[in-house]
């Protein structure tokens, strides 16, 4: 009997990231008696839900239950039955749902209502589904990576990492500026974490995720096309795709480029030219107006960049596919590789990457070029500061992203003071 293992005193939590292009379910685990320590929570499972993002279910809300089934059943298997009832489940929807809400609160509510009803059917402690703000998305991403990197731990207050997050519909930049006043109150966050104060800058650029940026670029470029053929430098030579004008103008992101066109469809014909693609993308960033000492683009305040940055989500996935995540690869080298990649004929690309879905494969030239344009011209990284960008997918087995930070906050696992001190009221938490 002496050798019998004691039941481990652990807790679990589930967060669903309802993004614009897909939903992912994350399961986290931590030792119950250490929940106020930094770095003890870790991810034990990621389940990617098959299908698009929840905002695409507007016309088929009855399918949402089935859509979520596989991953919720997976959670049932992974988490011991005895823990089900005390395992919290949170769903956070991001920019795809912000865009749907912008078009219609009713439709966004309807989708979330059905999601809530579906998730309530499971034996877990469902805590609700909501659309998180862009500011929350940025802040929780920053908390996640610094928690996992142990940057809140050290008494000397080693520098925190900045967070760069790229999704399908938005992108976030979050960091602690160096002795710089955050000139725009909308971009300022104050945290007290583990006994230390942090003045954090964050901004979420809605419509500047990689998918919505592509829709914007297409809507901009078709304005000046002489006919229903769009010769596009952001797609490989020989690539062809028909686009419905109605699909192009479905999103609020293309509203400023909307016009009456003499055709219902147009054909993208790839010409694969990185430089021209880059130039076209730059036209999406309005840098002519800045009411502050310094801006990113579109009149949004951005303090001087400071310290190291973790670039995750699509920043990582795209650069990983392009084999450009190594810290040894300079910005000049990345640009050089992108030039070569975009110039490769479509037939050749399809052969080289036979296992990759054509829809995704066709967009890597645009996405890679967009990432470079966003980081360099949008956020003002330079060839020198490029080495401070670390493309990261996971940190010690946990995905970099907003979900862990969100759960840590909602479960009150990030204390304002060092855990040694007396427990404080909930009001002191983030």
């Amino acid at each position: 009997t002496q050798n019998k293992a004691l039941p481990e005193n652990v807790k679990y939590g589930i967060v669903l990231d309802a993004g614009s292009s897909h939903t992912s379910l994350y399961i986290y685990k931590w030792p119950a008696e250490k929940e106020n320590d930094t770095g003890v929570v870790h991810q034990v499972e990621e389940c990617r839900v098959k299908g698009p993002g929840i905002s695409k279910f507007v016309q088929k809300v009855n399918e949402i239950g089935i859509y979520l089934t596989d991953c919720m059943e997976r959670a049932r298997e992974v988490i011991p039955r005895s823990q089900h009832q005390e395992t919290p489940v949170y769903l956070g929807a991001t920019a795809g749902m912000r865009l749907l809400r912008m078009e219609s609160e009713e439709l966004a509510d309807r989708v979330l209502d059905v999601v809530e009803r579906s998730l309530s059917n499971y034996p877990f402690d469902f805590q609700g589904a909501r659309i998180i703000t862009g500011q929350e998305e940025g802040a929780y991403g920053w908390i996640t990576i610094n928690y996992l990197l142990g940057r809140f731990k050290t008494p000397g207050g080693s520098e925190t990492f900045g967070a760069l997050d790229l999704g399908g519909a938005s992108t976030q930049v979050t960091f602690v500026p160096q002795n710089q006043t955050i000139e725009s109150p909308d971009n300022a966050l104050q945290f007290r974490l583990y006994g230390k104060d942090y003045n954090v800058y964050t901004h979420s650029f809605l419509c500047y995720g990689k998918d919505q940026a592509l829709w914007q670029k297409l809507a901009k470029d078709i304005q000046v096309a002489s006919n229903e053929i769009l010769r596009d430098p952001c797609f490989h030579p020989g690539y062809k795709k028909v686009v419905n004008v109605s699909d192009l103008y479905k999103t609020p992101c293309t509203k400023r480029f909307e016009m009456t066109l003499p055709f219902q469809q147009f054909e993208i014909q790839g010409i694969g030219n990185y430089q021209q693609c880059h130039q076209s993308i730059l036209e999406l960033f309005n840098t002519s107006y800045c009411p502050y000492s310094q801006c990113a683009f579109n009149g949004i305040f951005l303090p001087p960049l400071q310290g190291d940055f973790g670039a995750f989500s699509a920043f990582y996935f795209v650069m990983k596919f392009l084999n450009l995540t190594s810290e040894k690869v300079s910005q000049e080298k990345v640009t050089e590789m992108m030039k070569k990649f975009c110039a490769q004929p479509w037939e050749e690309i399809k052969t080289s990457y036979a296992g990759v879905k054509e829809k995704y494969l066709s967009e890597y030239c645009f996405s890679g070029t967009y990432i470079l344009s966003l980081l360099l011209q949008g956020y003002h990284f330079t060839a020198d500061s490029w080495e401070h960008i670390h493309f990261i997918g996971k940190i010690q087995g946990s995905d970099a992203g907003w979900t862990l930070g969100y759960m840590l906050n909602l479960t009150n696992m990030i204390p304002a003071e060092q855990p040694l001190s007396t427990p404080l009221s909930h009001s002191t938490y983030v």
């Epitope: 912008m102 609160e105 009713e106 439709l107 609020p252």
Partner: antibody, heavy 116, light 111 residues
């Protein structure tokens, strides 16, 4: 708490233009559209159009197209409506309202009087 | 354009009784399983105040005595029991398609 604060009353001459403002607070300004509504004689409500603060794109009621211009300044979280070539028919209260399809929050209104 | 015909144009109801206002659309205002029909209350010198959204959902802080119903083209707003504070103008609105339109209004008074 969400608030929409509109500019004060305007007395303008026929043929002139008027530009009114609507300052938003209590929410992310670029996450919601801003609509403009005209109310004449305390009874008839007419939707003028809306602007997407995110990018400045706008959609109008055909009746007001070409005569109304909608703009925003995102740094000051303010939406503007300019109406040109005013006639006595334009004497009315003008409201801004936040929403996609649900006008849950309204400004207090700007009263415009067109008189020689 | 979708035309909304509101009736009656004016209505006097005794305190504690039921007030019913009707709104008929020239075509269906339903889409994707949602009725894009809204009801507003407006008091003199004030902006309209959202009472009901999506035909039957109560707006934030709206008392339970305000009830909306209907779908497709026929909608109604019921107020029961009528209170003195309910004296106001009431408007229906559709946002199914541009241009968004309002009904002509109903003036509700105490009998």
């Amino acid at each position: 708490e969400v608030q929409l604060q509109q500019s004060g009353p305007e007395l303008v001459k026929p043929g002139a233009s008027v530009k009114m403002s609507c300052k938003a607070s209590g929410y992310t300004f670029t996450d919601y559209n801003m609509h403009w509504v005209k109310q004449s004689h305390g009874r008839t409500l007419e939707w003028i159009g809306y602007i997407v603060p995110l990018n400045g794109g706008s959609t109008f009621n055909q009746k007001f197209k070409g005569r109304a211009t909608l703009t925003v300044n995102t740094s000051s979280r303010t939406a503007y409506m300019e109406l040109r070539s005013l006639t006595s028919e334009d004497s009315a209260a003008y409201y801004c309202a936040r929403g996609g399809t649900r006008f849950a929050y309204w400004g207090q209104g700007t009263l415009v009087t067109v008189s020689a | 354009d979708i035309v909304l015909t509101q009736s009656p144009a004016s209505l006097a109801v005794s305190l504690g009784q039921r007030a019913t206002i009707s709104c008929r659309a020239s075509e269906s205002v339903d889409n994707f399983g949602v009725s894009f029909m809204y009801w507003f209350q407006q008091k003199p010198g004030q902006p309209p105040n959202l009472l009901i959204y999506g035909a039957s959902n109560q707006g934030s802080g709206v008392p339970a005595r305000f009830r909306g119903s209907g779908s497709g083209t026929d909608f109604s707003l019921n107020i029961h029991p009528m209170e003195a504070d309910d004296t106001a103008m009431y408007f229906c609105q559709q946002t199914k398609e541009v241009p968004y339109t309002f009904g002509g209004g109903t003036k509700l008074e105490i009998k």
